[in-house]
Interface confidence: medium
Amino acid sequence: SSPTSSASSFSSSAPFLASAVSAQPPLPDQCPALCECSEAARTVKCVNRNLTEVPTDLPAYVRNLFLTGNQLAVLPAGAFARRPPLAELAALNLSGSRLDEVRAGAFEHLPSLRQLDLSHNPLADLSPFAFSGSNASVSAPSPLVELILNHIVPPEDERQNRSFEGMVVAALLAGRALQGLRRLELASNHFLYLPRDVLAQLPSLRHLDLSNNSLVSLTYVSFRNLTHLESLHLEDNALKVLHNGTLAELQGLPHIRVFLDNNPWVCDCHMADMVTWLKETEVVQGKDRLTCAYPEKMRNRVLLELNSADLDCDPILPPSLQTS
């Protein structure tokens, strides 16, 4: 008996994995076990199937590959290397697949890969060469244009004895492979700081999402080189104030829109420059929603409604007069 056609353009097989580059390419109309395929849409979906490895028999036509909601654990080098290569694969979504390790060269041999989503994976071990593929000081340029790394921070007890921020940044900067990256999302990663060199080496960025982190200050971060930046998401961080240098850099970016909601702004004398800037600038979206969190007497006051008389600092007492 032959399979009957379905009204949907998706086909699938429903059988299971060992990893090897197959010498015999799959037939063009085949679909890997536990996946759904649409050749018309050039899409393969292997979603919520508890896969423990990337299917080896992916069809050569695949342009969009969804491997979300699985149990992949580790992406080895050449996880998507095939003969012939998956030359058309442009969008790869691996979110929520319990990945805790992405090894060097995991995305090698994907010449058209433009979008990669690794969100919601507890990446305790992200190789510095995960995206560049080699440890050369200058690697071949990656085709990646969008890199989505939201909520990839592992639980605290699973983190290596090193800075999580440093591990992620090392992968972003290795071999200068991501010079063409236009969108970078790093939301919800408990970042305490942003290493100062990261943005300078991603000159093509149009969209940067750092929302829902724990950033306290941007003092050592330079936005000067990001002349193409269109959106900067800094909502839901721990920012207390933006200082003059940062304000001037942001104002100097020709296309920028900045999002600053839900930060614990400290409305004391150090806030005066930022309040003045906010009143004049057009770059901050929803600036009328920004409110003070501290000191207590200023809580919930709207920043735009403050004047210099509101922004005072308690005098610093000499040590002999300070109370404990």
Partner: antibody
Framework: EVQLVESGGGVVQPGRSLRLSCAAS????????MHWVRQAPGKGLEWVAY????????YYADSVKGRFTISRDNSKNTLYLQMNSLRAEDTAVYYC?????????????WGQGTTVTVSS | DIVMTQSPDSLAVSLGERATINCRAS??????????MHWYQQKPGQPPKLLIK???NLESGVPDRFSGSGSGTDFTLTISSLQAEDVAVYYC?????????FGGGTKVEIK
Amino acid sequence: EVQLVESGGGVVQPGRSLRLSCAASGFTFSNFGMHWVRQAPGKGLEWVAYISSGSSTFYYADSVKGRFTISRDNSKNTLYLQMNSLRAEDTAVYYCARSPAYYRYGLDYWGQGTTVTVSS
Amino acid sequence: DIVMTQSPDSLAVSLGERATINCRASQSVSSSTFSYMHWYQQKPGQPPKLLIKSSSNLESGVPDRFSGSGSGTDFTLTISSLQAEDVAVYYCQHSWEIPYTFGGGTKVEIK
């Protein structure tokens, strides 16, 4: 006409090995994923193993993982199941079955089965 | 593993009457596009035979008195008018993930 014919069953002592074969005809064997399913005496069906059409992908039930190996020879239109370290609980009728190369459909053709008895 | 629970274990129905068999999966076996649930008939001394694929699609050559329905976790096989040749054990099976698992079977007899 699609035909699947299993062979290689028999009586074997615990800890020994056996190799089952499944000869396929009446369809393009190399286009189809293949399975082994077993049925213990008086019991229900238990899926055992799967191999993709080009032998690039294998899956096994936990109960046989590390002991059984599924393979195929597309040039001979034959599916195999190498069974090592056999146990009494492996006693069953073993069926080979075909699943379509694409589409989500179930096991559309089955062989008549071959009986494996593991007993000392 | 996904557990497939079939009910009832056995069923005695008069010739020409309706027989209904239920199968419940311990988690959803349907995507937004398909249901990965199939039904088989097994007569004594014979291998299983695919009756219904993907919840509701009748395999070619199967009489149209057989029908399947359901999605997510709950599925039903119905024989609208039981014939003598329908006496058999019926199994549901999912193909959502590894391992494929079968229900325990429902024995259908003539009352």
